[in-house]
């Protein structure tokens, strides 16, 4: 019968020919006139046989990532009779892996959004690299992830590529971060190949800022002839948050005379001071009221940032009008 060994060829061999192995029949004692033949895809081109000895050589550089095995057929003929010595047999030449492919991040670009002030350990995103080398061949495709840029705010789990928060971040100080992740094969050992990817991490706003009045005192005037409902001036607060978290409501905190009201312009986020009752210069020529401002939407969990509302004092002077 055929005497079989496993046939392997390392990929990317630079030699002009590489000895793969030898076809042999156990009937071949060296004194026979046995001629070995190689058939199938790759025979005569990729693989050449010395028909006199059965020695098979690879004469082309092979790429395992392109083709990992070749199925060939062997024949052996006794040239004295012209007959087959053994039945034709199929066998495999495997292309063995070398570490010739670097890890690649296939899902680039990576972008993630995470709420500001998220606690340490919060999962941001998972990045995954692929390595075309053989995962069953040593460590050629075993990857380790590391952080090249992004400390101290982020960390990456070495084996999973999961990026987590390692330090709280304030969107109002910096609203986005570029993190650079490296994947190394050979589990980072010498001779490892690497690939990198960038991750844009944006911080989404949480309502961690209360609105604060720009001025602690506003001076307004109102004519004694002004009808009720007249807008006599505006006040304004600022909020470092954005969007819904910066929406605010103004209100009167103190107005003993109950003469004034404040309504909120939700487009401009201003407070409009309105005359609720007519005023009379001769009766009272000035008023002092206190206004307060609060966010429109406050999450229960963020109440600690909103315990005391910002207030401002408004002095209103009544203008005299000549009466007939």
């Amino acid at each position: 019968g055929w005497v079989w060994n496993q046939f392997f060829v390392p990929e990317e061999m630079n030699t002009t020919s590489h000895h793969v192995g030898r076809l042999r029949s156990d009937l071949d004692n060296g004194n026979n006139s046995f001629q070995y033949k190689l058939l199938g895809a790759g025979a005569g081109s990729t693989f050449i046989i010395d028909e006199r000895t059965g020695d098979i050589y690879a004469i082309e550089k092979l790429d395992r990532e392109e083709r990992s095995l070749y199925i060939l057929r062997a024949q052996v003929i006794d040239i004295t009779t012209g007959r087959a010595v053994e039945p034709e047999s199929e066998f495999v030449i495997k292309v063995s892996d070398i570490n010739d492919n670097e890890p690649k991040f296939l899902d680039e670009p990576y972008e993630a959004i995470v709420p500001e002030m998220s606690p340490e350990g919060t999962l941001v995103i998972q990045v995954t690299a692929s390595d075309a080398d053989d995962p069953s061949s040593g460590n050629n495709a075993r990857l380790l992830y590391s952080l090249l840029q992004g400390q101290p705010y982020f960390s990456v789990e070495p084996t999973t590529g999961v990026i987590r928060i390692s330090s709280k971040m304030d969107r109002e100080l910096q609203d986005e971060y570029w993190v650079i992740i490296q994947a190394k094969d050979m589990i980072g050992q010498p001779g490892a190949l690497s690939g990198t990817t960038s991750v844009l991490i944006k911080l989404s706003d949480v309502n961690d800022n209360k609105p604060i009045f720009k001025e602690s005192l506003y001076r307004l005037t109102v004519s004694e002839s002004a009808p009720t409902g007249t807008s006599i001036g505006t006040i304004m607060a600022y909020d470092n948050d954005i969007g819904e978290n910066a929406e605010m409501d103004y209100s009167i905190e103190e107005d003993d005379s109950q003469t004034f009201d404040i309504i909120t312009n939700h487009e401009t986020q201003e407070g409009i001071v309105i005359l609720k009752k007519k005023v009379n210069f001769e009766h009272q020529n000035h008023y002092g009221i206190r206004a307060k401002v609060k966010n429109h939407h406050v999450d229960e969990q963020l109440m600690k940032y909103h315990t005391e509302a910002s207030t401002t004092f408004i002095k209103i002077q009544v203008e005299d009008v000549d009466e007939p």
């Epitope: 002009t16 006139s33 010395d50």
Partner: antibody, heavy 120, light 108 residues
């Protein structure tokens, strides 16, 4: 047409190693078997062995332990190394082309031969 | 290995005569894988016959080969002056390849 030319030392000391080179011109070394044959003075021819262009070799069992052959397809050359020389290795050494793929064939063409004398 | 015995060792003939050279193998030579060569002093052998009976390119038809199995013959029908040389047989049906000891054809 294909021509072969042997080159190497004419005189070698006993116990030393002989190195000969055969240069092929007028055709490619690839695709063929290449043999070395020797002829002691006044005697018959002896096949030493062959090398295939891919590097596969087969040597005469009588010399196998002392013979090494190599091939350089880029230079269109093949070589013979014979170690532990004695006076019995004194001969004219020929290189010749065997067939292309397949079973053994006759030798054609031949180099003109080079005389190697083993003497101290 | 197959041992080839050539006879006679020397053949003395005159130009124009017929020469018959014998090559006997110690065992059957596969598929008549036998060649004949001519060698002149100081020269390399020159292929005459292969496959026991096929003439090589450029070989005159006065040279012919025959035989099979273990007995092979080279015949030169009418010797020309340039034919006086040593003739070798060689088998290539089995490894190692072997040559006969040679037959010298000399002028009588």
């Amino acid at each position: 047409q294909v021509q072969l030319q042997e080159s190497g030392p004419g005189l070698v000391k006993p116990s030393e190693t002989l190195s000969l080179t055969c240069t092929v011109s007028g055709g490619s070394i690839s695709g063929y078997y290449w043999s070395w044959i020797r002829q002691p003075p006044g005697k018959g021819l002896e096949w030493i062995g062959y090398i295939y262009y891919i590097g596969s070799t087969n040597y005469n069992p009588s010399l196998k332990s002392r013979v090494t052959m190599s091939i350089d397809t880029s230079k269109n050359q093949f070589s013979l190394t014979l170690s532990s020389l004695t006076a019995a290795d004194t001969a004219v050494y020929f290189c010749a082309r065997d067939g292309s793929s397949g079973w053994y064939r006759w030798f054609d063409p031949w180099g003109q031969g080079t005389l190697v004398t083993v003497s101290s | 290995e197959i041992v080839l015995t050539q006879s006679p060792g020397t053949l003395s003939l005159s130009p124009g005569e017929r020469a018959t050279l014998s090559c006997r193998a110690s065992q059957s030579v596969s598929s008549s894988y036998l060649a004949w060569y001519q060698q002149k002093p100081g020269q390399a052998p020159r292929l005459l016959i292969f496959g026991a009976s096929s003439r090589a390119t450029g070989i005159p038809d006065r040279f012919s080969g025959s035989g099979s199995g273990t007995d092979f013959t080279l015949t030169i029908s009418g010797l020309e002056p340039e034919d006086f040389a040593v003739y070798h047989c060689q088998q290539y049906g089995n490894s190692p390849l072997t040559f006969g000891g040679g037959t010298k054809v000399e002028i009588k």
